[in-house]
């Protein structure tokens, strides 16, 4: 039969510039001598010869003189290959081919890696920064392999995904320099972190920059928003109220107004240097231009969607700046429940039935209550599931499993916890007349 050749299943990971051992072994029979051995290492894809051992002799490296066998271990079945000063170009699959009387082969993968340097951060512009200014933060990390994954986050660890451009360029050695650019609108102050991850080494290199914009000696702008969340029905328009107190002589040319998503800092709408810069949020936002000069910085959000739910920051900068966050709570009423009964014929007292209560297209998730005709809660044997559709609206299905009495009314109440809206349905079951003794 064929000779069994063993290699590691997982790739061998080697750092650029270090030596790597590609393990390969076979089981020599008793009386085996090296004169009988033919060992060939080759590149799996191109069949290019890397190293060989034949007729009792090491034939040497055919691969830039950077390979070696372990001659003292060959007789014990160790056919491993030592690859020195690993380069990016070495990455790939190597086949270990062993022939004695029979032959066998197996391929081992070499995965090359190089750690990325600690990122350097540059900020442009880097002076005279004010809230509302757009800055470009560049994160650069060098001489890594393979290509990096780059992540940006704010000081609270919230990912920043909008307006990121990442480029990776390989040098002559095949090592990558990575440059990632984040373009962000400045708030009151902020920390921006860049994390460069080597996916093979699971090595993270990170740096951060903290930006504190210039403040005016004349003091902060006071910004007012409602304390309670603004509740808006899906498909309707919502007003996120925000106001400030303009000083005498205030003109709109002095105003920087920015609405952004609180968590991700994604720009929603802006007004700068006397002009409405428009919606950066799917063209569904608008200011109240006629009211801005009186200090009304409110935002109108049209055709509200479930995905809009969350916190919006209203950021006002005149000489100085101030900001406040307002929460948008999205809601959608649940439909009147439909009730189904299974089985639904030839029902007798003592039968077990399944009653399903279904209500559709509500938000957020519902609370479901069951009760009997006397208003007594039914809690045992209830299974409720809620599934969101593509718009994020929930369909709720609640199943009650109950043993029939003589007669019974079963009510299902679907409550929207935000709207405090109750939708209910009920079913009355009249069993067949009892016969004595009951039929089996």
């Amino acid at each position: 039969g064929a000779l069994e050749v063993q290699v590691p299943e997982d790739p061998v990971v080697a750092l650029v510039g270090t030596d790597a051992t590609l393990c390969c072994s076979f089981s020599p029979e008793p009386g085996f001598s090296l004169a009988q051995l033919n060992l060939i290492w080759q590149l799996t894809d191109t069949k290019q010869l890397v190293h060989s051992f034949a007729e009792g002799q090491d034939q040497g490296s055919a691969y830039a003189n950077r390979t070696a066998l372990f001659p003292d271990l060959l007789a014990q079945g160790n056919a491993s290959l030592r690859l020195q000063r690993v380069r990016v170009a070495d990455e790939g699959s190597f086949t270990c081919f062993v022939s004695i009387r029979d032959f066998g082969s197996a391929a081992v993968s070499l995965q090359v890696a190089a750690p990325y340097s600690k990122p350097s951060m540059t900020l442009e512009p880097n002076k005279d920064l004010r809230p509302g200014d757009t800055v470009t933060i560049t994160c650069s990390s060098y001489q890594g392999y393979p290509e990096a994954e780059v992540f940006w986050q704010d000081g609270q660890g919230v990912p920043l995904t909008g307006n990121v451009t990442t480029s990776q360029m390989a040098n002559e050695q095949g090592l990558f320099d990575v440059h990632s650019i984040l373009r962000v609108v400045l708030g009151a102050n902020g920390t921006y972190s860049c994390l460069v991850r080597n996916p093979v080494l699971q090595q993270d290199a990170h740096s951060s920059v903290t930006i504190t914009p210039q403040r005016s000696p004349t003091g902060a702008v006071e910004v007012q928003v409602p304390e309670d969340p603004v509740v808006a029905l899906v498909g309707t328009d919502a007003t996120l109220r925000c106001s400030f107190s303009p000083e005498p002589g205030f003109s709109l040319a002095q105003l920087n107004l920015i609405w952004q998503l609180t968590d991700t800092k994604q720009l929603v709408h802006s007004f700068t240097e006397g002009r409405d810069q428009g919606s950066a949020y799917a063209n569904r936002t608008a200011l109240f231009p006629d009211l801005l000069a009186q200090g009304n910085a409110s935002l109108r959000l049209q055709r509200v969607r479930v995905a809009d739910e969350g916190s919006f920051t209203c950021f006002v900068s005149i000489r100085d700046f101030g900001s406040a966050a307002v929460s948008l709570q999205v809601a959608a009423p649940y439909s009147k429940p439909s009730m189904t009964l299974e089985p639904n014929k030839d029902l007798r007292p003592g039968d077990t039935v399944t009653i399903t209560c279904s209500s559709y297209r509500g938000y957020p998730e519902a609370e479901v209550f069951w009760q009997d005709g006397q208003g007594v809660p039914l809690t045992g044997n209830v299974t409720t599931s809620q599934m969101a559709n593509e718009q994020g609206l929930f369909d709720v299905h609640s199943v009650l499993r109950v043993v029939l009495g003589a007669n019974g009314t079963y009510s299902c109440l679907v409550r929207n916890p935000v709207l405090q809206q109750d939708a209910h349905g009920s079913v009355t079951i009249t069993g067949q007349p009892m016969t004595f003794p009951p039929e089996a």
Partner: antibody, heavy 116, light 107 residues
Framework: QVQLQQPGAELVRPGASVKLSCKAS????????MNWVKQRPDQGLEWIGR????????RYNQNFRDKARLTVDKSSSTAYMQLSSLTSEDSAVFYC?????????WGQGTTLTVSS | DIQMTQSPASLAASVGETVTITCRTS??????LAWYQQKPGKSPQLLIY???TLEDGVPSRFSGSGSGTLFSLKINNMQPEDTATYFC?????????FGGGTKLEIK
């Protein structure tokens, strides 16, 4: 190091148009607004307008709205200003300068002469 | 537009003297004022921004002060290389506007 390179001089006929260039290097071109400033001999400085190279958003001084048009070519990190319907009043040195509030780097200026 | 009035239009000073140039604005611009120096045949160079912040590389004999509508640029210990025209510029509003300039010469 930061550099803004402008051609030294342009000579054009009255009524014609000219496109002045400003090639930026040594920094991230899209990170700074590019401003254009006019200076007539022995006179003060006049701000013409500015452009954001990132998205080509422009702001103009109303006095130049019908005279100047600002554009950029991101691939070559070059800002342009086209001046149209030229008259002798347009003879001046035109500078490009980067920044929003502070103009921390200026080009050497292009001397535009409008003459028949 | 915000009007910028610079004074004097020109002056001559001796080496070692202290020179003060003023700039008045037509409305309150808080502290958003910059000063530029322009030597003959050269482009302007930023000296001071935010009324009193010295730009990197500018000699410490230059200083700025003021806020609101009245600002000044002071040159202590005047040097021959300070011969130039000085401009103020407001950065509070668009369009950006410059003062008419002050031509400073050596006596």
């Amino acid at each position: 190091q930061v550099q803004l390179q402008q051609p030294g001089a342009e000579l054009v006929r009255p009524g014609a148009s000219v496109k002045l260039s400003c090639k930026a290097s040594g920094y991230t071109f899209t990170a700074y607004w590019m401003n254009w400033v006019k200076q007539r001999p022995d006179q003060g400085l006049e701000w013409i307008g500015r452009i954001d190279p990132y998205d080509s958003e422009t702001r103009y001084n109303q006095n130049f709205r019908d005279k100047a048009r600002l554009t950029v070519d991101k691939s070559s990190s070059t800002a342009y200003m086209q001046l149209s319907s030229l008259t002798s009043e347009d003879s001046a040195v035109f500078y490009c300068a980067r920044g929003v509030r502070i103009f921390d780097y200026w080009g050497q200026g292009t001397t535009l002469t409008v003459s028949s | 537009d915000i009007q910028m009035t610079q004074s004097p239009a020109s002056l001559a000073a001796s080496v070692g003297e202290t020179v003060t140039i003023t700039c008045r604005t037509s409305e309150n611009i808080d502290y958003t004022l910059a000063w530029y120096q322009q030597k003959p045949g050269k482009s302007p160079q930023l000296l001071i921004y935010n009324a009193n912040t010295l730009e990197d590389g500018v000699p410490s004999r230059f200083s700025g002060s003021g806020s609101g509508t009245l600002f000044s640029l002071k040159i202590n210990n005047m040097q021959p290389e300070d011969t130039a025209t000085y401009f103020c510029k407001q950065a509070y509003d668009v369009p950006r506007t410059f003062g008419g300039g002050t031509k400073l010469e050596i006596k």
